[in-house]
Structures are given as structure tokens and as C-alpha cells.
Amino acid sequence: VPRWRQQWSGPGTTKRFPETVLARCVKYTEIHPEMRHVDCQSVWDAFKGAFISKHPCNITEEDYQPLMKLGTQTVPCNKILLWSRIKDLAHQFTQVQRDMFTLEDTLLGYLADDLTWCGEFNTSKINYQSCPDWRKDCSNNPVSVFWKTVSRRFAEAACDVVHVMLNGSRSKIFDKNSTFGSVEVHNLQPEKVQTLEAWVIHGGREDSRDLCQDPTIKELESIISKRNIQFSCKNIYRPDKFLQCVKNPEDSSCTSEI
């Protein structure tokens, strides 16, 4: 008789989750010499320990501390790129502009990117059937708490000019409920961060509006200013050209506004 198990509203743990994490860890530590000291088995043991045998709606940041400790990494604090609802372009950008880093360019972000995971209370099993949905089930689930924890630490580490890429195609260009709006904005350190520079990415080819005047951007400016951090904003009218010009800055067409 199969044992009754909690049915959550979200998708279950990503297939082959443990091996995926382990393989990503090995790949990352081999590509990044400064992380060669990391023992990937220990990283997996700590990752597993954060959620295995625990109720998947009762996960805390404390549960992830052993993993955070093992994944401690120094990135240039003035080369941080945050993003909201436009992950792919942000990642394409840092793949070209190799001296800038998104969270997913760090070990811990790289390990978990696009993965889902959860366990079950009082059993050592990984739940491959379903995991809690942030809205429908609970917010203190393993995935949400992980991203909240690493995002907070990433924002806290930032200094000087911090960049954020925002999706100009969305109704809320700045969304207070996004990870950027609810975690990262509030954990930038005013004593270290001088300016937050927003890059608003336009979707339509003929979209020539100044999206930096959008009410949600003004709301972001207000929040940032109240935290004694300067704010600036740029429209990226042509994201394809923007990337091309990052790759080839000498190109004659790159002197005009992107």
C-alpha cells in the first residue's frame, strides 16, 4: 500500500537533481580557479542537509547556512549586475562582459539555476512528485528560501555602482514583489553602494518611449533615494544591438544611442 504523501501545487524536484548539482559544481570549480578548493561532495551534502527530512513549508535561512559557508565566494563588489524578469539577457550580457557578474555567475546561483527541489518531513526522500508553490502553498519552501538567502547575501556584497536590468515589456517594470524588489533593493548597503543604475530593456523595435519615466521606475527611485543611494536610469531601446556593441564596442554604429 503506497504511503500517503503531501500533494503540493508546484512541480516536483527536477529529475536527477543530486547529480545535476554535483556535476554543475564540478564544472564550475574547474572553470573558476579561485573555487578549486571547494569540495563538491561536501557542497552537495550541505545542500541536501538544508531540506531533506524537513517540512517543505518550514525551511529557514538558517537551514542553508552550512551551504552558504561552503559556497562563500568573493566577486568584485563593483561589478554586480542584478536583474528582474529578464534573466536570459542578463546572462547573455555577463557571458560577453566577463568582468560583470549576476547571481547565477556565482557558484551557488549556478548550482540552483532553473532547478526545483524539496523533501518530506521525517523521511530522507527527495520529493520528485510535487513541491510547494510560493503563492498557492507557502513562501518558506526550499527553493524560495534558497533564492532569498543567496540574493540577500549577493546584494549585501555589492559596492560602488550597482546595475540592474529590468524588463520594459512588463506592466510592472519594477515589481516590489520580485526578488529584486523585495530582497535585493532592501539589502544594498548605503555605506558601500553609491549608485543603483537601472537599465530598462525595451521589447518592441519601434518603442521609443522613455521608460525611465514609468511610475514603477519612479517608485524604485523613491525607495533607493530614501536609502541614501543615488539612482540613475537608462533606456536600452535595442537589446540586440546593445549586446552586439558590448561584443564589438569599436563598431561605428555603437556610438549612437542603443
Epitope: E19, D39, C40, S42, K125
Partner: antibody, heavy 123, light 110 residues
């Protein structure tokens, strides 16, 4: 050519200790997890212990927990198994084996095995 | 008593196809990979199949692995006299943090 050479086996009395060694060559030892697997006379394979490439993580079979300790010296390309409080049921050929993929041991097949060293626990 | 159950013996004539089964539970084989090892008489084990159905280089394609639910199988086609050996299935159990071996199957080529 990848080679693993076990040594340190022998006859020991119950309650005694023994330290097995496994000298590795032909590959970058510090990049791979390593295991000990044993085989009692006329019996099947029984996994004993495993250690990650950098030695930061180990795991042992319940039957040897608290008695056996796996360790490695990456500068000497050598794997060890310290066996204390030995029992008659520990009598076996002990094999050391290399992990197939780099660094970790979870889900990582043992792709190269040594020829084994014999441990006999008897009074 | 092994957690993975294999038949103690199997046999076949040269040229025949034989299969060896390995039965587990929904806490190991069902969710984890299966590995197969061959141990020729008086020698160390040799990796034959990894991650359910992958063959390491040097292993003839006569050997194949498959898995369905809580059972795995090793198939040997075109049986040869040198295939006479003990065959072990194994799986890594991440819950126990340990390798589990089947009891082994002695294959006799008649």
C-alpha cells in the same frame, strides 16, 4: 595506465587494528573520489567506505561505522583505511576503487579497481 | 540479506542471449541509477554498465543494461565462454549515503 595497488593486509586478532594503503598512479589522484569495497571468502561484494577528492566528505557502511576510518594523502597519491576493533566478520579481500567522474562520490561508479589485499581476523 | 535481489545463478549456451535481473524498491532503483560489475574468477571486479544503460569504453556492445520501475536487467547477447563470471548490480542510495550491492549472480556458460 591507471593502477591501484593495495597493501597492509594480514592476519590480526579480534579486537586488533590494521591500516590498509592503496597507492594510486596513472591519473590525477586528487581529482577523484576513492572507495574501499570488501569481499568475504565465497561471498559477494560489500561496500565499506568512500572519500571525496579533497577529503572533505566521507561516508561509511553501517557495519563499520565507529571502527573504520577512510582518509587520503593527495600529496602521496595514497588512500588509507584505518581498521580498529576488528571482528571475525571483517575477514575479506579489501579492494580500493577509483570514482569514474571527478570530485564527488554520490552516484559515481567505481571504474577502476585494485587487485585487493587480504585481511584475516582470527585468534 | 541484500537490499538488491539478484538470482544466485544463471546459465546459457554459447551464442545465446541471457538476462540477469536486479530487483530493488522505490527508495533505490526506482529513483537512482543502476550499475553493473563483472567479476571473473580470481580477479577484481570490472565496471560493465553505469547509469542504467551506459557502457564504459572497452566494454563490448554485447552487454546492455535497462531499467523499469524498481527492476533493472543486464542482458548479454552472443554469450561467450569468457563471460562466465559473477555479476553484481549496485546502486547509490543517497538517503543512506551508501552503495548497495546485489548478492551477485553466477553465470555459467554451458
Amino acid at each position: 595506465e591507471v593502477q591501484l595497488l593495495e597493501s597492509g593486509g594480514g592476519l590480526v586478532q579480534p579486537g586488533g587494528s590494521l591500516r590498509l594503503s592503496c597507492a594510486a598512479s596513472g591519473f590525477t589522484f586528487e581529482d577523484y573520489a576513492m572507495s574501499w569495497v570488501r569481499q568475504a571468502p565465497g561471498k559477494g561484494l560489500e561496500w565499506v567506505s568512500v572519500i571525496s577528492s579533497k577529503g572533505g566528505s566521507t561516508s561509511n557502511a553501517d557495519s563499520v561505522k565507529g571502527r573504520f576510518t577512510i582518509s587520503r594523502d593527495n600529496s602521496k597519491n595514497t588512500l588509507y583505511l584505518q581498521m580498529n576493533s576488528l571482528r571475525a566478520e571483517d575477514t575479506a579481500v579489501y579492494y580500493c576503487a577509483k570514482g569514474m567522474e571527478r570530485q564527488y562520490y554520490s552516484y559515481n561508479a567505481m571504474d577502476v579497481w585494485g587487485q585487493g589485499t587480504t585481511v584475516t581476523v582470527s585468534s | 540479506q541484500s537490499v538488491l535481489t539478484q538470482p544466485p545463478s544463471a546459465s546459457g549456451t554459447p551464442g545465446q542471449r541471457v538476462t540477469i535481473s536486479c530487483s530493488g524498491s522505490n527508495s533505490n532503483i526506482d529513483v537512482d541509477y543502476v550499475y553493473w560489475y563483472q567479476q571473473l574468477p580470481g580477479t577484481a571486479p570490472r565496471l560493465l554498465i553505469y547509469k542504467d544503460d551506459q557502457r564504459p569504453s572497452g566494454v563490448p556492445d554485447r552487454f546492455s543494461g535497462s531499467k523499469s520501475g524498481t527492476s533493472a536487467s543486464l542482458a548479454i547477447s552472443g554469450l561467450q565462454s569468457e563471460d562466465e563470471a559473477d555479476y553484481y548490480c549496485a546502486t547509490w542510495d543517497d538517503n543512506l549515503n551508501s552503495w548497495l550491492f546485489g548478492g551477485g549472480t553466477k553465470l555459467t556458460v554451458l
